[in-house]
Structure formats: structure tokens, C-alpha cells
């Protein structure tokens, strides 16, 4: 008789999840000499320990702390790029601008990027059929709590000028409910962070509006200012040209506004 299994609203654990995490860990530690000391089997054990045998709607930050401990990594605190709803461009940027880092350029972010996982209460099984959806089921699910935990620590580590890339094509350019809006903004440390600089990425070729005047950007400015952090904003009218100019800053066309 097949055992009854909780049916959640979200997709199940990514197939070959354990193998993927382990393989990503090995690859990352080979590419990044400063992380060569990391024991990937121990990292997987700690990752697994955070959600296996636990109810997938009752995961806490505490559950992930052993993984955080093993994945502790020092990135230059003044070279942090946050992003919201524009992950691909942010990653393309840090692939070119190698001295800047998104969360997914760190070991823990790299391990979990684009993956889904959850377990079942009181069994050592991984649930490949379905996992809780943040809205329809519960917010304290393994994936959401993981990103909340790593995002909080990433933001806490930031210093000097912190950059954030925002999607100017969205109705809410700054969304208080995004990970950036609900976690990272509130965990920047005013005693370390001088300025948050927003880069608003335009979508349309002919879009010449000043999106830094958008009401949601003003809301972000207000939140940041109340935290005693300065705020600045730049429009990136041509993201393709922006990336090209990061690659080739000497190009004559790169002196004009992008």
C-alpha cells in the first residue's frame, strides 16, 4: 500500500538534488582557491540536516546555521551587488566585473541557485513530488528560509557603497515584499554602509523616463534614509550597452549616458 504523502502546491525537489549540490560544491571549491578547504561532503550533510525529517512548513533560520557555518566566506564587503527581479543581468554583470559579487557568486548562493528542495516530517526521504509554495502553502518552507537566511547574512556583511540592480520594467520597481525589500534592506548595517546606490534597469529601447523618480524608488529612499544610510539612484537606459561598456570601458561610446 503506497504511503500517503502531503501534496503541496509548488514543484517538488529538483531531480538529482543531492548530486547537484555536491557537484556544484566541488566545482565551486575548485574554481575559488580561498574555498579549497571546504569539505563538500560535510557541506551536503549540513544542508541535508537543515530540512530532512522536518515538517517543510516549520523550517527556521536555526536549522540552516550549521550550513552557514561551513559555508562562511569572506567577500570584499564594499563590492556587493544586490538585485531584485533582475537576476540574469546582475549575474552577467558580475561575470564581467569580476571584483563584484552577487549572493549567487558565493558558495552557498551558488549551491542553491534555481533549485527547489523539501523533505517530510519524521522520514529521511526527500520529496520529489511537491514542495510548499510560499503564497499558497507556507512561508517557512526550506527554500524560502534558506534564501532569507543567506540574504540576511550577505546584507549584514556589506560595507561602504552597496549597489542594487532593480528592474525598471516591473510595476513595482522596488517591491517591499521581495527578498531585497523585506530582508536585505533591513539588514544593511548603518555603521558600516555609507550609501545604497540603486541602478534602475530600463526595458524599452526608447524609454527615456527618469525612473529614479518612481514612487517605489522614493519609498526605498525613505526607508534607507530612515536607517541613516545615504541613497543614490542611476538610470541604466541601455542595459546591453551598459554591459558592453563594463567589458570595454575604453570604447568611445561609453562616455555618454547609458
Amino acid at each position: 500500500v503506497p504511503r500517503w504523502r502531503q501534496q503541496w502546491s509548488g514543484p517538488g525537489t529538483t531531480k538529482r538534488f543531492p548530486e547537484t549540490v555536491l557537484a556544484r560544491c566541488v566545482k565551486y571549491t575548485e574554481i575559488h582557491p580561498e574555498m579549497r578547504h571546504v569539505d563538500c561532503q560535510s557541506v551536503w550533510d549540513a544542508f541535508k540536516g537543515a530540512f530532512i525529517s522536518k515538517h517543510p512548513c516549520n523550517i527556521t533560520e536555526e536549522d540552516y546555521q550549521p550550513l552557514m557555518k561551513l559555508g562562511t566566506q569572506t567577500v570584499p564587503c564594499n563590492k556587493i551587488l544586490l538585485w531584485s527581479r533582475i537576476k540574469d543581468l546582475a549575474h552577467q554583470f558580475t561575470q564581467v566585473q569580476r571584483d563584484m559579487f552577487t549572493l549567487e557568486d558565493t558558495l552557498l548562493g551558488y549551491l542553491a541557485d534555481d533549485l527547489t528542495w523539501c523533505g517530510e516530517f519524521n522520514t529521511s526521504k526527500i520529496n520529489y513530488q511537491s514542495c510548499p509554495d510560499w503564497r499558497k502553502d507556507c512561508s517557512n518552507n526550506p527554500v524560502s528560509v534558506f534564501w532569507k537566511t543567506v540574504s540576511r547574512r550577505f546584507a549584514e556583511a556589506a560595507c561602504d557603497v552597496v549597489h542594487v540592480m532593480l528592474n525598471g520594467s516591473r510595476s513595482k520597481i522596488f517591491d517591499k515584499n521581495s527578498t531585497f525589500g523585506s530582508v536585505e534592506v533591513h539588514n544593511l548595517q548603518p555603521e558600516k554602509v555609507q550609501t545604497l546606490e540603486a541602478w534602475v534597469i530600463h526595458g524599452g529601447r526608447e524609454d527615456s523616463r527618469d525612473l529614479c523618480q518612481d514612487p517605489t524608488i522614493k519609498e526605498l529612499e525613505s526607508i534607507i534614509s530612515k536607517r541613516n544610510i545615504q541613497f543614490s539612484c542611476k538610470n541604466i537606459y541601455r542595459p546591453d550597452k551598459f554591459l558592453q561598456c563594463v567589458k570595454n570601458p575604453e570604447d568611445s561610446s561609453c562616455t555618454s549616458e547609458i
Partner: antibody, heavy 119, light 107 residues
């Protein structure tokens, strides 16, 4: 019966060295993180060092960093603490403790071994 | 200086309920455990993972956690509960840290 038994405590001069051992029995030693915790006379508990289950990761209190080394031999079910450049303030009872699922708590403690640093 | 703060002493009469508190910013995102140390003996785990009791620990001992503080409650106080009580958690560097300890006297 689950047990931890420390040994190696002694009277040593400042600047000297000492190696503490902790033998484990009654559980799968190689599955668990282990810690050293100390208690100076009349004082509270102070965490000293941690080691991961496979021995590949170690962590130290700032007060002992660079002087103490935690290690383990999983084939012998033994935890070690190598203590160099000892100071008077290292005088304490040293306990080894088993970590329950990383960060749940320290669920098994040894009886402690006394280290006295004095000239 | 411990990043977990405990009152140095507490007292109660037999049968009474006493509460020992522990506070510190790192408690918010880390599990809290509690230890009892009877005079001249090694510490013993009383509470793990914020509020759970290991087998063998009487249900007179209970614990809770909220925000940056945690507390241990002992109901039906007995003379053999006279001991030092320590809270522990991981700190912001994810290393163990103990509170300064609370000496419980049964009057």
C-alpha cells in the same frame, strides 16, 4: 552506555605545552561534531574549540586561536586538544562534549580534566 | 564578556516555580540550549533546540524563546535543583557561547 573520558590534565609552567585526550564510547563518534569547553576556578563555562564530524573543519575561541589545536582520530574514537604557549588564564577544568545535531546542544559531557598553569 | 546575559543568582522555596532568563542578540537566529551543573560535577543538558527535553529530564523543566531572549522555568522546585544553570547558543560568528550562569538557591 554513552561516555566521554578526558585525560592529560596536569600542572604545567607558563609557555609550556599539554595535550588533552577524550575517549568516546557508546555512540558513533565519527557522526558527531565535538567540542572542548573549559571552566576556570569559580567561573562559568567557556567554549574553547569545535571540530566537524570528519575533522575537516575546526573553529576556535579568540582567546585560544593560534595556540590550541583541536583534532580527532575517528578510527580510535578519540578527540584531542593540543595546547601550546600556555598562560595562567588557561587554568581550568577542560571538558569534552558531544554536539547533538550540530547546534541543538551538547548532550554528552566528560567528567573533565584539570589543567593548572603556574610557575 | 559573554554575549548572553544571565542574572547571577535566583532563589525559590520548595514547590515554587522559578524562571531563569537569558538574553542576547544572537538568540534570535540560533537554537538555545540549557545546562544544569550540580556542585563538583560536569554540566548536564536540560533543554535542547530552544524548548525540547532530552529523555530522563523531568517535565518540571521547561523552556521558551522569543526574539532575543530565552527562559528556563522550573516548577515544583526541589532541593536537588540547587545548581548553576547556563544557557548556550551560537553567536553571530556561529560559534558556541555560554551565558555567565545563574546560581539557583533553594531556600
Amino acid at each position: 552506555e554513552v561516555q566521554l573520558l578526558e585525560s592529560g590534565g596536569d600542572l604545567v609552567q607558563p609557555g609550556g605545552s599539554l595535550r588533552l585526550s577524550c575517549g568516546a564510547s557508546g555512540f558513533t563518534f565519527s557522526d558527531h561534531y565535538m567540542s572542548w569547553v573549559r571552566q576556570a576556578p569559580g567561573k562559568g563555562l567557556e567554549w574553547v574549540a569545535d571540530i566537524s564530524a570528519r575533522g575537516s573543519n575546526t573553529w576556535y575561541a579568540d582567546s585560544v586561536k593560534g595556540r590550541f589545536t583541536i583534532s580527532r582520530d575517528n578510527s580510535e574514537n578519540t578527540l584531542y586538544l593540543q595546547m601550546n604557549s600556555l598562560r595562567a588564564e588557561d587554568t581550568a577544568v577542560y571538558y569534552c562534549a558531544k554536539n547533538w545535531n550540530y547546534n541543538y546542544g551538547m548532550d554528552v559531557w566528560g567528567q573533565g580534566t584539570t589543567v593548572t598553569v603556574s610557575s | 564578556q559573554s554575549v548572553l546575559t544571565q542574572a547571577p543568582s535566583a532563589s525559590g522555596t520548595p514547590g515554587q516555580r522559578v524562571t531563569i532568563s537569558c538574553s542576547g542578540s544572537s538568540i534570535q537566529n540560533n537554537y538555545v540550549s540549557w545546562y544544569q551543573q550540580l556542585p563538583g560535577t560536569a554540566p548536564k543538558l536540560l533543554i535542547y533546540r530552544n524548548f525540547e527535553r532530552p529523555s530522563g529530564v523531568p517535565d518540571r523543566f521547561s523552556a521558551s524563546k522569543s526574539g532575543t531572549s530565552a527562559s528556563l522555568a522550573i516548577s515544583g522546585l526541589q532541593s536537588e535543583d540547587e545548581a548553576d544553570y547556563y544557557c548556550a547558543s551560537w553567536d553571530d560568528s556561529l560559534n558556541w557561547v555560554f551565558g555567565g550562569g545563574t546560581k539557583l538557591t533553594v531556600l
